[in-house]
Interface confidence: low
């Protein structure tokens, strides 16, 4: 005996045993293939999920994660907290980097700003929660425009001078 359900296209289900007619999927349900005996309930994008694509009679809703979270698993089955630059993931969730630390990645942990003074360099640009300090070049021993006399440094490399 032929299966009357095979005539039911996507978006319908072989729900009615009446003259082999097919029934449209009710609201909030879908069938993506022909011949289905029932429609599937549409996925609801709630909580940490938000709707990327609405459910239709022939396809399920597509969810994405709300800002601060990213998808995990097939079809965005789960959302995991996804900290932005300037934050790090702790047991309490995403927390801003404390003063003196930064994180310039969308993952990772807050790291201390570079201490320019350890390299004998000045701070060219202050650090932020999301950006490290930018150190300037190592200073010479004189300020520009100051009269000076140069003399070879004993044992020094050629071209190096010492300010008196």
């Amino acid at each position: 005996v032929p299966d009357p359900c095979s005539n039911c296209s996507a978006g319908t289900f072989c729900g009615k045993n009446i003259q082999e007619l097919c029934m449209p999927c009710p609201s909030n349900s879908f069938s993506s293939t022909s011949g289905q005996k029932a429609c599937n309930v549409c996925r609801k994008c709630e909580g940490v999920f938000r709707t990327k694509k609405e459910c239709s009679s022939t396809s399920n809703a597509v969810c994405e994660c709300v800002p601060g979270f990213r998808c995990l698993g097939a079809g965005c089955a789960m959302c995991e907290e996804y900290c932005q630059q300037g934050q790090e993931l702790t047991q309490e969730g995403c927390k801003d980097c404390s003063f003196g630390t930064f994180n310039d990645e969308e993952h990772g942990v807050c790291r201390p700003w570079t201490d320019c003074s350890l390299a004998g360099k000045p701070v060219l640009m202050n650090g932020t929660k999301a950006r490290d300090v930018v150190c300037g070049p190592r200073p010479t021993d004189f300020s520009p425009g100051t009269p000076s006399t140069t003399m070879p440094v004993p044992g020094g490399e050629p071209g190096h001078t010492s300010h008196v």
Epitope: V1, G15, K16, N17, I18, Q19, M23, P26, S27
Partner: antibody, heavy 118, light 110 residues
């Protein structure tokens, strides 16, 4: 357009019984037909249906206990092995509808009484 | 399997009064609901189909409403001829419920 059931009688448990639904004024090639029963003092109970192409569907409790078949003008319901619980008035009803999915019974027969007793 | 729960099982009304019968489906039946009236010794008679459409020859005092899983039959200006048992019936599915009808509501007119 009319629907009339016949064949109801007193039978002993286990004796097969066939009820007949005779239709006039419309074609069984255009309408599906269903059997519904009602035990004395009880509600309506759907048994099964036969589609225009002769495909049958049954309520889960009725599978194996009933067989529906048809000719060009008649629909039969065979009670394969009646028990006392099958004592009821058996109705034949025409299924009608529109828009591919709105369905209802628009014509009913007067019913035929089946009594199963030893 | 879809199940229909009808409430109340019995209701009494005075002539001219109003009767409300409820039918709850176990899942959405998308307005695929019919209402029938049955008097003793008679077959059921179609009153309402597709949840709210009045069948031919049925008085306008009968009104069907509802959607999704909740449906209602309202009889306004009840008459003595309305004394009967009323049944709701869902659309038919291949994997049909064991009883496609509600349990019935007896309306007694005083």
């Amino acid at each position: 357009q009319s629907v009339e059931e016949s064949g109801g009688r007193l039978v002993t448990p286990g004796t097969p019984l066939t009820l007949t639904c005779t239709v006039s004024g419309f074609s069984l090639s255009s309408y599906a037909m269903s059997w519904v029963r009602q035990a004395p003092g009880k509600g309506l109970e759907w048994i099964g249906i036969i589609s225009t192409s002769g495909i049958t569907y049954y309520a889960s409790w009725a599978k194996g206990r009933f067989t529906i078949s048809k000719t060009s003008t008649m629909v039969d319901l065979k009670i394969t092995s009646p028990t006392t619980e099958d004592t009821a008035t058996y109705f034949c009803a025409r299924l009608n509808g529109f828009d591919d999915y709105v369905r209802y019974f628009d014509f009913w027969g007067l019913g035929t009484l089946v009594t199963v007793s030893s | 399997a879809i199940e229909l729960t009808q409430t109340p099982s019995s209701v009494s009304a005075a002539v001219g009064g109003t009767v409300t019968i409820n039918c709850q489906a176990s899942e959405s039946i998308a307005s695929n609901l019919a209402w029938y009236q049955q008097k003793p010794g008679q077959p059921p008679k179609l009153l309402i189909y597709a949840a709210s459409y009045l069948a031919s020859g049925v008085p306008s005092r009968f009104k069907g409403s509802g959607s999704g899983t909740e449906y209602t039959l309202t009889i306004s200006g009840v008459q003595s001829a309305d004394a009967a048992t009323y049944y709701c019936q869902s659309a038919f599915y291949v994997s049909s419920s064991d009883n496609a009808f509600g349990g019935g509501t007896e309306v007694v007119v005083k």
